[in-house]
């Protein structure tokens, strides 16, 4: 069976390879050879065996979330949502699929990663690739010029994911965006403040937020001698500088993208620089860069941004990095990306390589792409890479062997003797009606030891024990699972006592 599964995977991989070679217009001989290999692999699967036992698995790049993982996820979401709300954001939702036309031409080289849906009767549809383009469509469609919103939802990318590093084909994004005409850099600074607040609250390790500006990049490319048509493709090369050496980036720009070596060297002098506000000031004095209108605007805005970031108390977390060239076509101004400096791995362990954990920027032209009159709505926003954060938190908890509660049950209604099911059902109902999170075991006569064991395993802190004598006395025995201490509580005081012990507010308002 394992051999068959391996062969099936090889057939799939070889099929992808053949398709890739055809797309790249590889030599006819190479394609012919790889097709012949594919046919030989298929022949080894056998004629009718393809109708063999269906392998139960989730599709490539997706995963199920176990209760434990969901508990982690909800904690992470809670931190993020509380921060978004603290900053006054409203919440919206949009369809998981959009008209294909809506997404086309918005993502540059990444467009190939969009999932197209099979024709469903006329409309050409695609799964959303991010939450930003649907947000811009929402603004244009509803003629909104001013909103501060957050949106947490799944997005889809036909990536080849390295799932061990927290990358998937279906994953959550948590976006916060401010749309509207405001004074320069105030909303941008708030977005960076939010990013820092969230990453600090999540306690996933030290981080750095790299900041740059699309106008500085474009201005720099212009003065270095890059033609307009090559800006975007050179951007995507420069953006790899956090992963590979300058030599490799230069080779790609010269060898694959046809840039002259001297132009690449001029770019290299700039993009290898990073620092703080002093670098902004240094570049404002740069004889060539300061002569470029776009770059000058960008540098001026960054200087202002650093002033606000200092007032927000986060300037120590920010680095002006000229190699940051985020790969999305729609950015027009400030761009930023948060990276973990090192994850809290145990001493001697390899730090987790999860890369960027949050990113964003200004995209003043995107809404205008959807408006018939091209009316622009300036926007700035950020996206938290929660899947990567889930991976880090999960691995950290595993390393610490920390037990995570997957339910919020406060009390188990138990009985010490037989024939007390009716009494347990009455009591658990009273507790539910009073807003207490309660459970009981679905057995007529459960053993007390089994009930206590269930509490231990599920992390339930309290047990309300009913017995013949307690019923006569009008009391319930309330037992703490950890300390094993028991007290008799009058039935009418039980709700209040449970709330007191579990720190729940006394009224469910």
């Amino acid at each position: 069976m394992a051999e068959r599964a391996a062969l099936e995977e090889l057939v799939k991989l070889q099929g992808e390879r053949v398709r890739g070679l055809k797309q790249q217009k590889a030599s006819a001989e190479l394609i012919e050879e790889e097709v012949a290999k594919l046919l030989k692999l298929k022949a080894q699967l056998g004629p009718d065996e393809s109708k063999q036992k269906f392998v139960l698995k989730t599709p490539k790049g997706t995963r199920d979330y176990s209760p434990r993982q969901m508990a982690v996820r909800e904690k992470v979401f809670d931190v993020i949502i509380r921060c978004f709300k603290r900053h006054g954001a409203e919440v919206i939702d949009t369809p998981v699929f959009e008209l294909k036309e809506t997404l086309m031409g918005k993502y540059g080289e990444d467009s190939k990663l969009i999932y197209d849906l099979k024709d469903q009767g006329g409309e050409l549809l695609s799964l959303r690739y991010d939450l930003t383009v649907p947000f811009a469509r929402y603004l244009a469609m509803n003629k909104l010029t001013n909103i501060k919103r957050y949106h947490i939802a799944k997005v889809y990318r036909r990536d080849n994911p390295a799932m061990t590093r927290g990358r998937y084909r279906e994953f959550y994004q948590c976006d916060f965006d401010i749309a509207g005409n405001f004074d320069p850099m105030i909303p941008d600074a708030e977005c960076l403040k939010i990013m820092c607040e969230i990453l600090s609250s999540l306690q996933i390790g030290d981080f750095l937020v790299k900041v740059n500006d699309r106008r500085i990049l474009d201005g720099m490319f212009a003065i270095c001698g890059v033609s307009d048509s090559k800006f975007r493709t050179i951007c995507s090369s420069v953006d790899k500088l956090d992963k590979v050496s300058w030599e490799e980036v230069k080779n790609e720009m010269v060898g694959e993208k046809g840039l002259a070596p001297e132009v690449a060297d001029r770019i290299g002098d700039y993009v290898q620089q990073h620092g703080g506000v002093s670098l902004v000031e240094q570049l404002l004095q740069d004889p060539k860069l300061s002569q470029n209108k776009q770059a000058l605007e960008g540098l001026g805005d960054l200087k202002l941004l650093f002033e606000y970031l200092t007032l927000f108390g986060i300037d120590d977390k920010i680095s002006f990095d000229l190699s940051l060239a985020r790969g999305l076509d729609y950015y027009t101004g400030v761009i930023y990306e948060a990276v973990l400096l090192q994850t809290p791995a145990q001493a001697g362990e390899e730090p987790l390589g999860v890369g960027s954990v949050a990113a964003g920027g200004r995209y003043d032209g995107l809404v205008g792409m959807f408006d018939p009159k091209g009316r622009k709505v300036p926007c700035v926003g950020l996206s938290i890479g929660v899947e990567r954060i889930f991976s880090i938190v999960e691995q950290r908890l595993e390393a610490l062997e920390e037990k995570i509660r997957t339910t919020e049950t406060q009390v188990l209604v138990a009985s010490a003797q037989k024939k007390l099911l009716e009494e347990r059902l009455k009591l658990v109902s009273e507790l539910w009606d009073a807003g207490i999170k309660a459970e009981l075991l679905y057995k007529k006569n459960p053993k007390l030891l089994n009930q206590l064991q269930y509490c231990e395993e599920a992390g339930i802190p309290l047990v309300a024990i009913i017995g013949e004598q307690e019923l006569k006395d009008g009391v319930i025995k309330l037992r703490s699972v950890t300390s094993r201490e028991e007290v008799d509580v009058r039935r009418e005081d039980l709700v209040e006592e449970i709330k007191r012990r579990t720190g729940q507010p006394l009224c469910i308002c």
Epitope: L7, E9, L10, L13, R17, K40, L41, Q44, N160
Partner: antibody
Amino acid sequence: QVQLVESGGGLVKPGGSLRLSCAASGFTFSDYYMSWIRQAPGKGLEWVSYISDSSRYTKYTDKVRGRFTISRDNAKNSLYLQMNSLRAEDTAVYYCARYLYQVIAIADAWGQGTLVTVSS
Amino acid sequence: DIQMTQSPSSVSASVGDRVTITCRASQGISSWLAWFQQKPGKAPKLLIFVASNLESGVPSRFSGSGSGTDFTLTISSLQPEDFATYYCQQAESFPYTFGQGTKLEIK
């Protein structure tokens, strides 16, 4: 069981020639792509050349192209590597290896290797 | 040519330890990666193919993961016979290249 046995290695002077052979048994030789992989003393592995099941496709690394020729005789269940204009840097243990699932460039069966020493 | 970089180049560990070796490709290779074990004076032995498939007869303490450019070989609980040199190899495009090797030594 699958068996690959190389022969033909030895000491040769720079510029000289050698012909390596590999005798295969325990599987249907004519169904499989085959390859030569070498390992210089104390060094890592290097894929030298491969040949398809029917000899239609052959490839060589840049280092040996034009000097080495891979061939096979399916009737004799044998694989060969003709090495000409040998250089000191060709000194290595040469392994004959079979492709995984007939066509996948991952060696799932290897010979014991034959040592080629190029020295004056 | 696709460059394969293994890390660490050598690692010392004890019987029962969990060991992880990583392999990085200079460009994306999908899942076209294999792991081999080689003992002194012997031919390499295939352990894992297409990133995560265990070759038949290989103990289940060996596992592989990864896709694209980053791959991992994990030995969950080292046995005395596991001390050897481990190589990764890309099978994405010719010339098929190996990593420089990781020597696993007894601590």
